[in-house]
């Protein structure tokens, strides 16, 4: 039997301070741009070498964006996503969701030293 | 990972146009940030245009601006340059280059750092 993939999914509020070249990341998605089935949130897509994001270390690829600054990310469209961003002034508050792939062993069993649970 | 593959270059005369097209790998298509770019033997890799993950933004070096057209099918995972009334000074190597998504930041377009995938080019040569 195939061990199932398993997600563990934890929030976290990441305080960027906006660097010589900007935050240092791309996103998508968004209402006219959904990235995930039945799911027009907001995705970061490329942490940029050197940048802001990449030097405080937190955030990753894959990681969903909720809110900036406080303010939700839910159902913009993906241009006024990227305009919030470039808007958000010199420092950034994130609140990101990271969903981390957890393999376990068959259905039915743990295997011993699995930490899920 | 994002395969590129360029091509309709060739020979041509002064005045004469070329349509060039760029297909690119993967699912994400439409969320590509794209750009194509050009080297002539001898000098440093040049922006030539660049187009947003919809198509409706676009950006033009001067030396091509009025031109040359950048355009995508999102359909068919494929971007274009449309370059009319060629001259000598555009033979060169042309690529296409992609980043993933639209960068958050003020976007330096022609900065070749700031895409992350690249072609093999294909050469236009003006004559």
């Known amino acids: 039997m195939n061990g199932r993939v398993d997600y563990l999914v934890t929030e976290e509020e990441i305080n960027l301070t906006r660097g010589p070249s900007g935050l240092g990341f791309n996103i998508v998605g968004g209402t006219d741009q959904q990235y995930v089935s039945n799911d027009s949130g907001i995705y970061v897509s490329r942490i940029k070498e050197n940048g802001a994001a990449a030097l405080d270390g937190r955030l990753q690829e894959g990681d969903k964006i909720l809110s900036v600054n406080g303010q939700d990310l839910k159902n913009l469209l993906h241009q006024d996503a990227v305009d919030l961003f470039r808007n958000a002034g010199y420092a950034v508050s994130l609140r990101v969701q990271h969903r981390l792939q957890v393999q376990n062993g068959p259905i039915g069993h743990r295997g011993e030293g699995d930490p899920s649970g | 990972h994002v395969q590129l593959v360029e091509s309709g270059g060739g020979l041509v005369q002064a005045g004469d146009s070329l349509r060039l097209s760029c297909a690119a790998s993967?699912?994400?298509?439409?969320?590509?940030?794209m750009g194509w770019f050009r080297q002539a033997p001898g000098k440093e890799r040049e922006f030539v245009a660049h187009?947003?993950?919809?198509?409706?933004?676009?950006y033009y070096a001067d030396s091509v601006k009025g031109r040359f057209t950048i355009s995508r099918d999102n359909a068919k995972n494929t971007m274009y340059l449309q370059m009319n009334s060629l001259k000598p000074d555009d033979t060169a190597v042309y690529y296409c280059?992609?980043?993933?998504?639209?960068?958050?930041?003020?976007?330096?377009?022609?900065?070749?750092?700031?895409?992350?995938?690249w072609g093999q080019g294909t050469q236009v040569t003006v004559s």
């Open positions: 187009i947003n993950w919809s198509g409706s933004s676009t």
């Open positions: 993967g699912r994400t298509f439409s969320t590509y940030t």
């Open positions: 280059a992609v980043t993933i998504g639209s960068p958050v930041d003020s976007y330096r377009h022609s900065d070749p750092l700031e895409y992350d995938y």
